[in-house]
């Protein structure tokens, strides 16, 4: 379809780099989350940092191109990296408007399918880009 994809946009304080230039930020008003209209893809992404007690959103926005996973209707995160011991970065890609607003589910830390403690360890500031 010709219409451009619109995604939730968020970047946590302290996150290095930005995906802001991958789309056009929209004025959506207070009742909606901050939104970005994608320029180069029809695909949203989300990154969450899962620790023992909670999941914290790190980044949400547009991908720079369409790729496998972008056809998903919902955000189903997969483990991608260990930014630090005891935390795991999960990412999703999906292809409907605002599909990256939240995830459908996250597996509990340490469950099957989650990278083990010997998984990739990211240096501070690198973890988000490893996840992307």
């Amino acid at each position: 379809p010709p219409n451009r994809r619109t995604c939730v946009f968020f970047e946590a304080p302290g996150v290095q780099g930005s995906t802001k230039t991958l789309g056009e930020l929209l004025d959506t008003g207070p009742e909606l989350p901050r939104a970005i209209r994608c320029l180069y893809s029809r695909c949203c992404f989300g990154i969450w940092n899962l620790t023992q007690d909670r999941a914290q959103v790190e980044m949400q926005g547009c991908r720079d191109s369409d790729e496998p996973g972008c056809e998903s209707l919902h955000c189903d995160p997969s483990p991608r990296a260990h930014p630090s011991p005891g935390s795991t970065l999960f990412t999703c890609s999906c292809g409907t408007d605002f599909c990256n607003a939240n995830y459908s589910h996250l597996p509990p830390p340490g469950s099957p399918g989650t990278p083990g403690s010997q998984g990739p360890q990211a240096a501070p500031g690198e973890s988000i880009w490893m996840a992307l």
Partner: antibody, heavy 117, light 111 residues
Amino acid sequence: QLQLQESGPGLVKPSETLSLTCTVSGYSITSDFAWNWIRQPPGKGLEWIGYISFSGSTSYNPSLKSRVTISVDTSKNQFSLKLSSVTAADTAVYYCARSRYSWFAYWGQGTLVTVSS
Amino acid sequence: DIQMTQSPSSLSASVGDRVTITCRASESVDTYGNSFMHWYQQKPGKAPKLLIYRASNLESGVPSRFSGSGSGTDFTLTISSLQPEDFATYYCQQSNEDPYTFGGGTKVEIK
């Protein structure tokens, strides 16, 4: 200061392939933005042909998609347009332009390409 | 494709006149209340120059006598007091849907 400069043959024969290059100075084309081709037949309006983004993704006007290829030469900081099977209807001034978001803030000066035998 | 219709196709005006050019899209060019309509000025033998983006935002360096308004399908470019250097052709462009499309142009001539 960003500058865009189109170059290529000014005359192309019908059924052949039109090839143009846009040389960009003052900015790396792999850093950001989309790099577009737009054309304007003599005395007529503007038609967007397509773009290649900084990451290499492309988008083409469906009316031309079957005949268009836009590519990039990062070593020369250039991007190129190839339009195959041209006819007289493809005679136009061809512009390269950089889009920030979805409008065109920087343009080359344009180059006239005539399709004629 | 979204069709863009500009009116008038040409007009004659004098220096100091207030000039209004309209652009109508065949369907809405808004996304969640944001209008993706842009305006350009083109002089003979030159490339177009961006004047207004996102319906009403003045491009840096463009004189404040230029303004844009509208939403949905109907948009207006206004020149509050026409200057000698403003005699040119003006184009609207939508970017709400691919492919990007332009209006047919409005030529502003000296009366």
